[in-house]
C-alpha cells in the first residue's frame, strides 16, 4: 500500500513580509500528479482558495493583488491527486506591515558605541502597543520580540545589549504591533545605524557555545544580555 502523498512546498514572492497595498504571490508546489491545489488560512473558513495547477501541473499560484489585513495570517496548502489529498505543507506566515503608524528607534546613550560597553535600543510608539519587534538587516534570524506580559500596553520597549561586540554593529529597524494579530505590524521605523568602534576581539562564536559550525555571527539571533526592563514586557526569541 502506498504511503501518504508527500507534502507540498509553500512560499511567497517577493517574500512573506508585505507592505499594505503591495501585491504578493503565494506558490504551492506539489507533484506532477496534482489535479487541484487548495490553500487554507488559519482561523478562516476553509477552503481559503482553490486553483488549478499550472503546467506542468506541479504547482499553483495564489495571487493577492493588494495586501490588506484580510490576507495576513498563517497558511497551509494541499494538492489533490487521483489517489486523494496530500499532507498539508509546512505553514507560511504572511505578515503585513503598515497597519499602524511607524515607531521611533533610538540608541541610548548613543548609536556610536565602544566595544565592550553597553547600549540600549529604544523603540517608541505614539499609541500604546503590546508587542515590539527589533529587526537587524541581513541577519538570518532578525526578529527579537518584546511582548507585554498581561496585555498591558506600552509606549516603548527597551532592547539592552551588553557587552557590545562588532557583531552588534549594523542597521536596525523596529516595528510595533497589537497582540490580537501578530501578523499585522506597524510601518517600519526609520533605520538606525549602530556603529561599534574599537573592536579587537574575534567576533566568531566560541567553541563552547552550542551553535552550528556552519553558522557565522550574522546567522545567529540577536541576543542582547541584561535584564528585561520592568515594563511588563517579556522577551521572546524567534
Amino acid at each position: 500500500q502506498a504511503g501518504p502523498l508527500p507534502k507540498p512546498t509553500l512560499w511567497a514572492e517577493p517574500g512573506s513580509v508585505i507592505s499594505w497595498g503591495n501585491s504578493v504571490t503565494i506558490w504551492c508546489q506539489g507533484t506532477l500528479e496534482a489535479r487541484e491545489y487548495r490553500l487554507d488560512k488559519e482561523e478562516s473558513p476553509a477552503p481559503w482558495d482553490r486553483q488549478n495547477p499550472l503546467e506542468p501541473k506541479n504547482k499553483a499560484r495564489f495571487s493577492i493583488p493588494s495586501m490588506t489585513e484580510d490576507y495576513a495570517g498563517r497558511y497551509r496548502c494541499y494538492y489533490r491527486s487521483p489517489v486523494g489529498w496530500s499532507q498539508p505543507s509546512d505553514p507560511l506566515e504572511l505578515v503585513m506591515t503598515g497597519a499602524y503608524s511607524k515607531p521611533t528607534l533610538s540608541a541610548l546613550p548613543s548609536p556610536l558605541v565602544t566595544s565592550g560597553k553597553s547600549v540600549t535600543l529604544l523603540c517608541q510608539s505614539r499609541s500604546p502597543m503590546d508587542t515590539f519587534l527589533l529587526i537587524k538587516e541581513r541577519a538570518a534570524h532578525p526578529l527579537l520580540h518584546l511582548r507585554s506580559e498581561h496585555g498591558a500596553q506600552q509606549h516603548q520597549a527597551e532592547f539592552p545589549m551588553s557587552p557590545v561586540t562588532s557583531v552588534h554593529g549594523g542597521t536596525y529597524r523596529c516595528f510595533s504591533s497589537h497582540g490580537f494579530s501578530h501578523y499585522l505590524l506597524s510601518h517600519p521605523s526609520d533605520p538606525l545605524e549602530l556603529i561599534v568602534s574599537g573592536s579587537l576581539e574575534d567576533p566568531r562564536p566560541s567553541p563552547t557555545r552550542s551553535v552550528s559550525t556552519a553558522a557565522g555571527p550574522e546567522d545567529q539571533p540577536l541576543m542582547p544580555t541584561g535584564s528585561v526592563p520592568h515594563s511588563g514586557l517579556r522577551r521572546h526569541w524567534e
Epitope: 488560512k41 482561523e43 478562516s44 473558513p45 476553509a46 477552503p47 481559503w48 482558495d49 482553490r50 484580510d70
Partner: nanobody, 121 residues
C-alpha cells in the same frame, strides 16, 4: 439548473426571529465555503456570515451576537438563524458558495436567487 435554493424569508416584527435555509448540490456543498450576503435597497451588498467545510464560521460585525450560521453535511444545506431582528436587517438575503477569499472579494463562484426578509411592525 439551479444549484443554490434559498427559503425561509418573510415578514417579521422587530425583535423576532427567522431561519433561512439554503440547499446546494452535493458537488458544490462538499468543497466550498457556504455563506450569506444581504443587500438592502440603495445599499452595497454585505457579507453576513460564512461557514467552511470544517465548520469554522465568520460572522459580520453588524450581526454579531444576533445571527448564527451552520451547515448540515447530511442535507447539503446551510442555515442562517437570525434573532433579535431590527428594521435595518431588512434586505434580500442571498446564499453563496465558493472559496472564502472570493467571499471577501464579493465574488463567490455560485449565487442563489435571493429571499426577501422584511422587519417591520
Amino acid at each position: 439548473e439551479v444549484q443554490l435554493v434559498e427559503s425561509g424569508g418573510g415578514l417579521v416584527q422587530p425583535g423576532g426571529s427567522l431561519r433561512l435555509s439554503c440547499a446546494a448540490s452535493e458537488s458544490i456543498f462538499s468543497s466550498n465555503v457556504m455563506g450569506w450576503y444581504r443587500q438592502a435597497p440603495g445599499k452595497q451588498r454585505e457579507l453576513v456570515a460564512a461557514v467552511g467545510i470544517q465548520g469554522l464560521t465568520k460572522i459580520g460585525d453588524s450581526v454579531k451576537g444576533r445571527f448564527t450560521i451552520s451547515r448540515d453535511n447530511a442535507k447539503n444545506s446551510v442555515y442562517l438563524q437570525m434573532n433579535s431582528l431590527r428594521a435595518e436587517d431588512t434586505a434580500v438575503y442571498y446564499c453563496a458558495a465558493g472559496a472564502y477569499v472570493r467571499f471577501l472579494q464579493y465574488s463567490p463562484d455560485y449565487w442563489g436567487q435571493g429571499t426577501q426578509v422584511t422587519v417591520s411592525s
